[in-house]
Interface confidence: low
Amino acid sequence: EAHKSEIAHRYNDLGEQHFKGLVLIAFSQYLQKCSYDEHAKLVQEVTDFAKTCVADESAANCDKSLHTLFGDKLCAIPNLRENYGELADCCTKQEPERNECFLQHKDDNPSLPPFERPEAEAMCTSFKENPTTFMGHYLHEVARRHPYFYAPELLYYAEQYNEILTQCCAEADKESCLTPKLDGVKEKALVSSVRQRMKCSSMQKFGERAFKAWAVARLSQTFPNADFAEITKLATDLTKVNKECCHGDLLECADDRAELAKYMCENQATISSKLQTCCDKPLLKKAHCLSEVEHDTMPADLPAIAADFVEDQEVCKNYAEAKDVFLGTFLYEYSRRHPDYSVSLLLRLAKKYEATLEKCCAEANPPACYGTVLAEFQPLVEEPKNLVKTNCDLYEKLGEYGFQNAILVRYTQKAPQVSTPTLVEAARNLGRVGTKCCTLPEDQRLPCVEDYLSAILNRVCLLHEKTPVSEHVTKCCSGSLVERRPCFSALTVDETYVPKEFKAETFTFHSDICTLPEKEKQIKKQTALAELVKHKPKATAEQLKTVMDDFAQFLDTCCKAADKDTCFSTEGPNLVTRCKDALA
């Protein structure tokens, strides 16, 4: 239904707290360099304006669209051109072009310092002094670094953060209470960020149809007892929610997500028997819980998939009459039978099925042509299964850090032109798949591994798009979203690459490395490893292991030395010489 004032409608639906949080996220995601105080001032102005519209929907400007209201606010910021360069040109455009322009200027890798967590005592002091401002800072800092973060989920993580601080700041040992809990939230939020970015990429590059196909597969796996009409309704609603969030319409997105959660909880009987625990929770927790609810028990009496999609005499007729619906039912039926497959794999199978029907239904004897289609799925299924087995075996043998290093070597050989920080970030993230997925039961490994890898590789593609340097990466990133992971896996050593010359300063270290946290130490070592591979792309695993072991030994020795500086300055050059010799 149409509302006289869109902003009043959203304020009423969401309530002041969520309204303000979402407006702050929106501004922080659009203008990523502005300080918290600048954004907080704008948020207050928008909120005050919303309240005047709630009181009188006919008041001046209350009938304007949210894009117009928010865009006007952003464009009124002083020194916009000095701080944001050509983004200021967006302000010369009219809606909807202006919002599109803002979206195009979102930076997936803003040059902002890493979000450092203050020490426990300081954090608790500022949280107790003003919890609202403290949480505002959290929303602002995360949103500006992750301009596509799923806004209602970010409110959920802020709520988690709040609960942890409330609990831990009352404890004697605040540090040991806060650290593991906040680390847990951070890890989950980072995964949520790359997953959502993947959804927005799917929407931006391939449109709503591609996203809806993803949603149908995912929902069918989770709710195998729901019928196709129910799955289609949920997929349509979920597509709308994600389209809004990816498009910067955060108030509408959060509102529609709450509506979808309400619908699911009111229609459990036709969706799933596993929803009640989620439905008992308050809004943010409820929606989060529903998004990762366990799979319902599969119906026991499902007929073989071949009956309707291979053996039926009407296959080509059904396909011709309504292609999207027929392919949708295939995807639904296949997915509900296979919670053990990744969504990417299911979409590849549906694509293969579609291509087979396109070819066969034009032939003289279609059933003879498409009769073997299910057998032809076998290699498509085996490939990711082998990937999971090989990588999980390697993870179990090497542990997370060693596994990350193996991936770093592999990917540096595949795309040595890519910047070292990007390769290290990608390898560290890809390497976490072991800890995240390889410890799961067998039937959950494949969906976990492949869908996580796909999301990480999407980030690699986004960063590469900004400065394309590798033909290998461009090739894999140009294809369809579901083919990316197999494409990257199939890449081998880039034979066109001219090795980097050996620079001693790249491998020169100082005593400051000794005081770094373990994670930062690892990144330094991994940076050196990537540089070694760039120098010698065809170095054997054995050669690289020798050099890295020597390097680790050198660090250990010098960091324990009484005179660290002298140790680094005398032993460092010896290490460099040994490295060169080992790789010669």
């Epitope: 007892n225 009111e266 459990q268 009987a269 036709t270 028997s273 929803l275 009640q276 008992d280």
Partner: nanobody, 115 residues
Framework: EVQLVESGGGLVQPGGSLRLSCAAS????????MSWVRQAPGKGPEWVSA????????RYAESIKGRFTISRDNAKKTLYLQMNSLKPEDTAVYYC????????GSQGTQVTVSS
Amino acid sequence: EVQLVESGGGLVQPGGSLRLSCAASGFTFGSFGMSWVRQAPGKGPEWVSAIDSGGTDTRYAESIKGRFTISRDNAKKTLYLQMNSLKPEDTAVYYCTIGQSTSRGSQGTQVTVSS
């Protein structure tokens, strides 16, 4: 199609008893928690009581605790509400719902407590 049909309501004097039934069809009744909800004239829906899918875990609103008992028979796909020591303020239309929701997907049964 999911259907819930309530019965057993009526006019009763204060202190009296009634037993409401809710016959379910169109879904796997034994897999879902169920609730009773009521709506008094001119008021919003009020959650009354809930029971889990197996019938072991029951919950009650403060206003009816000790007077009402919720139960179910999964073989018969039926939910029950035994109402004792009824009071005039229990007058309302009673609905059964799937899960612990206050949304009404059925016609309900009228309970009137009056002398």
